[in-house]
Interface confidence: medium
C-alpha cells in the first residue's frame, strides 16, 4: 500500500534573494496527520536528499540548504504526501530552480531633500541568512537597474516613470511642491529575473526649500 | 567644476534655422541634467528646453514643435535644434546644467510635463547670441 496517496497536485519555487521558498498544493480531503516530505537534487550531485520528514505546512524555507544557488547550476525539489505508513508519488518542481528564478526586489528606498532636489537612494538587500561575500552587488555585479514610479499627492495617477542604473538618483522639481511617493523596481539588463516594486515611500516638498539662483 | 561652453549663435531670417551646441567638461555628463535657457533684453531669463539623464525632454510651450534638445554623451555636448525661427527668440541662449547626487547617480525630471526652473540649475555657460530679424 506504498501509492494509495494522491500526490500533491503542483510544486514550485517561490524565491527572493536569499530567501528560497518551496510550496505546494495540497492534496484533495488530506487528514490532520497528512504530512508532506520534502526532498531536494542539486545539479550536478544527481541523489535526492531528504530535508523534512513530515512537514505539515503547505511550504519550506530551503534557505539554508540552498545558500550556494547563486555559483551553482540550480537545484530541483520534490514533495510527497505521507499518512502514517502510507505515502503518495513524488512531485517534482518542472522547472529547475536557479538564479534566474529569484525575484529581484530592494531593501528599501530612502528619500530626503537636498537643495529643493529629492534625492533617493536605493538601499539593496542585505539578507541575514546570505554569506558575507555574496552581497546583492556582487552575484549582480553588472547592469543593474531601476525602474522608478513617482506620484503626487493628492492624486493617485503615477506622475511619471524613470529608469536609472544606479542606486542614487535626484529628482529636480521645478519648483512643484506637495508630498511625492516613490516606488522603484529593480531588474538586470542582462538577466530574465522577475521584479518586485517596493513598498512606497513619501516626502513632502514646500516653497521654504526653493531657493533661486542666476 | 563644470566647464559649459556654447557655440552656434547668430543671425538668421525668420523661418530660419540654427543649431547651437554646449562643451560640457566634467565627470559623468551621462548622468546630468541639462538645459537651455534664453534671456532677451530687459526680460527674465527663462527655461527653453531641458534633457535629463534618461533621455526625457521638457519644452516651454512657445517653442513646443520647433525646437529640440538632445545630446551626445560621447562628445559630451548638448545641442539644441532651432527651426523655424521667429523675431520673438532674439535672446542670448545659455546652457546651464546639474550634476547627479553628490555620491554618484543619476539627475531626473520629475514629470514629463515639469517647467524648466532655472531654480533647479548649478551651473551656467557665459551664452551665444541668436538675433531673427524679420
Known amino acids: 500500500h506504498g501509492t494509495e496517496l494522491p500526490s500533491p497536485p503542483s510544486v514550485w519555487f517561490e524565491a527572493e534573494f536569499f530567501h528560497h521558498i518551496l510550496h505546494w498544493t495540497p492534496i484533495p480531503n488530506q487528514s490532520e496527520s497528512t504530512c508532506y516530505e520534502v526532498a531536494l537534487l542539486r545539479y550536478g550531485i544527481e541523489s535526492w536528499n531528504s530535508i523534512s520528514n513530515c512537514s505539515q505546512t503547505l511550504s519550506y524555507d530551503l534557505t539554508a540548504v540552498t545558500l550556494d544557488l547563486y555559483h551553482s547550476n540550480g537545484y530541483r525539489a520534490r514533495v510527497r504526501a505521507v499518512d502514517g505508513s502510507r505515502h503518495s508519488n513524488w512531485t517534482v518542481t518542472n522547472t529547475r530552480f536557479s538564479v534566474d528564478e529569484v525575484t529581484l526586489t530592494v531593501g528599501s528606498v530612502n528619500l530626503e531633500i537636498h537643495n529643493g532636489f529629492i534625492l533617493g537612494k536605493i538601499q539593496l538587500p542585505r539578507p541575514k541568512m546570505a554569506p558575507a561575500n555574496d552581497t546583492y552587488e556582487s552575484i549582480f555585479s553588472h547592469f543593474r537597474e531601476y525602474e522608478i514610479a513617482i506620484r503626487k499627492v493628492p492624486g493617485n495617477f503615477t506622475f511619471t516613470h524613470k529608469k536609472v542604473k544606479h542606486e542614487n538618483f535626484s529628482l529636480l522639481t521645478s519648483g512643484e511642491v506637495g508630498e511625492f511617493c516613490v516606488q522603484v523596481k529593480p531588474s538586470v539588463a542582462s538577466r530574465s529575473n522577475k521584479g518586485m516594486w517596493s513598498k512606497e515611500e513619501c516626502i513632502s516638498l514646500t516653497r521654504q526649500y526653493f531657493t533661486v539662483t542666476n | 567644476q563644470v566647464q559649459l561652453q556654447e557655440s552656434g549663435g547668430g543671425s538668421v531670417q525668420a523661418g530660419g534655422s540654427l543649431r547651437l551646441s554646449c562643451a560640457v567638461s566634467?565627470?559623468?555628463?551621462?548622468?546630468?541634467?541639462m538645459g537651455w535657457f534664453r534671456q532677451a533684453p530687459g526680460k527674465e531669463r527663462e527655461g527653453v528646453a531641458a534633457?535629463?539623464?534618461?533621455?526625457?525632454?521638457s519644452y516651454a510651450d512657445s517653442v513646443k514643435g520647433r525646437f529640440t534638445i538632445s545630446k551626445d554623451n560621447a562628445k559630451n555636448t548638448l545641442y539644441l535644434r532651432m527651426n523655424s525661427l521667429k523675431p520673438e527668440d532674439t535672446a542670448m541662449y545659455y546652457c546651464?546644467?546639474?550634476?547627479?547626487?553628490?555620491?554618484?547617480?543619476?539627475?531626473?525630471?520629475?514629470?514629463?510635463?515639469?517647467?524648466?526652473?532655472?531654480?533647479?540649475?548649478?551651473?551656467w555657460g557665459q551664452g551665444t547670441q541668436v538675433t531673427v530679424s524679420s
Open positions: 546651464a546644467a546639474v550634476p547627479p547626487p553628490p555620491d554618484g547617480g543619476s539627475c531626473l525630471f520629475l514629470g514629463p510635463e515639469i517647467k524648466v526652473s532655472k531654480a533647479d540649475f548649478r551651473y
Open positions: 534633457i535629463d539623464s534618461g533621455g526625457s525632454t
Open positions: 566634467g565627470y559623468a555628463y551621462s548622468t546630468y541634467c
